[in-house]
Interface confidence: medium
C-alpha cells in the first residue's frame, strides 16, 4: 500500500480551521492478525529523510491522535483530549484520512506527516507516510480562506473553513 497527499502546501489565515488530508492507496491485507493505525505528527524541515523526526501536534503525540482498525474502515477520534486541543482526526471507507485543526495560530505552522502503520501479530511494523506543509499567516498579506496547493501541479485552490 501507499499514502498519497492530495495537497503539499496549505496556506491559511490565523484563526481559521484547516483539514489536512491523506489517502491510503492500494490493496490492504484484511487478515485477522493485521491491524492498521492511521495517525499524524509534526516533523521538521531540512532532514535527510522527510518525517523521520517526530514531534507532537499541540502537545498531543501520534498515539493520542491515532485511528486504529482493520483496513479501509471509517473511524474518528472521539478523544476529549484531542478535541480540547482543537484537533480531530477521522477516516472514511475510501482510504481518506484527515486531521482537522481549529482556530489556527502562527505556532501551528510547519511540516505535518500522516502515517499508516500495518502491524502483524501485534509485533512487526510496516509504515508509510506522507508529508505536507502548513503556513499560517497573519496581517494584510494573509488570505481570507485557506489556499491549498496540489502535490502534482502548481495550481492552487481556495477552500472555505473546515
Amino acid at each position: 500500500f501507499k499514502v498519497a497527499t492530495p495537497y503539499s502546501l496549505y496556506v491559511c489565515p490565523e484563526g481559521q480551521n484547516v483539514t489536512l488530508t491523506c489517502r491510503l492507496l492500494g490493496p490492504v491485507d484484511k487478515g485477522h492478525d493485521v491491524t492498521f493505525y492511521k495517525t499524524w505528527y509534526r516533523s521538521s524541515r531540512g532532514e535527510v529523510q522527510t518525517c523521520s523526526e517526530r514531534r507532537p501536534i499541540r502537545n498531543l503525540t501520534f498515539q493520542d491522535l491515532h485511528l486504529h482498525h482493520g483496513g479501509h474502515q471509517a473511524a474518528n477520534t472521539s478523544h476529549d483530549l484531542a478535541q480540547r486541543h482543537g484537533l480531530e482526526s477521522a477516516s472514511d471507507h475510501h482510504g481518506n484520512f484527515s486531521i482537522t485543526m481549529r482556530n489556527l495560530t502562527l505556532l501551528d505552522s510547519g511540516l505535518y506527516c500522516c502515517l499508516v502503520v500495518e502491524i502483524r501479530h501485534h509485533h512487526s511494523e510496516h509504515r508509510v507516510h506522507g508529508a505536507m506543509e502548513l503556513q499560517v499567516q497573519t496581517g494584510k498579506d494573509a488570505p481570507s480562506n485557506c489556499v491549498v496547493y496540489p502535490s502534482s501541479s502548481q495550481e492552487s485552490e481556495n477552500i472555505t473553513a473546515a
Partner: antibody, heavy 121, light 112 residues
Amino acid sequence: QVQLVQSGAEVKKPGASVKVSCKASGYSFTDYYINWVRQAPGQGLEWIARIFPGSGNAYYNEKFKDRATLTVDKSTSTAYMELSSLRSEDTAVYYCARDDSFYGYWYFDVWGQGTTVTVSS
Amino acid sequence: NIMMTQSPATLSVSPGERATLSCKSSQSVLYSSNQKNYLAWYQQKPGQSPRLLIYWASTRESGVPDRFSGSGSGTEFTLTISSLQSEDFAVYYCHQYLSSYTFGGGTKVEIK
C-alpha cells in the same frame, strides 16, 4: 544532539531495590519509546522492557514483569527503571535505549552510557 | 521468542584483513508486507555502550564507514568488515526486532 544520560553506579544488597534514571535531550521525549537492556559481566545483551513516555504505557519481557517497573517524568524528560528483589545475578550494566517504532518494534538508534548495578552482601 | 545465534564466538583477524561474522535466527525475520528483514547489528567496545551499525539487515547507519556491510535474508545474516582498522576490534551483536526483541550472544573480533 540526541542524548540519553543515565544515573551513576549503584551498590545494593540482595533483596533490595534499585532505581536507575535516564534523562533524554535533543528530541521530543514524549514521542519515542525508551527501552531498558542489561548486560551481565562478560555476557550479551538482554531486553528488559520499554515504555512510551507520552502515555506511560509499559511493556515487559515476561522474565522481568514481576520485578521491573518503568515510569517517566515528562516534566524533566526522564525515564526510570526500578528493579526489586535484587539477587546477585542482577549484577550488570543497565542501558536505556531509544527505539524509533510507532506501534510495533524497531532497532535502537540511541543508547545511554550505562549504569553499573552491583548486588552484593 | 526468536532465538539469535552468532558465530564464531571469537574471531582473530589481522589489521587490513576481512572479517565475516554470522548470525542465524530460529525463525525468519523477513516481513512479507515490505520484504524487509528486521535485523540490526551493533558494535560494542570495552567500557562503552552499543552503537548501531546496520539496520534492515543491510542499511548502514549514518556515519558508519562503508567498510561495514550487512547481507542475508530470512534466517541467515552476515556482517562483513572489508578491511579491519584498529578501531574495529570490538564485540558485535545482531538483534531481531520483528517479534519483541532478542539479541545474539555476540562475536568478539580480536587482533591476531
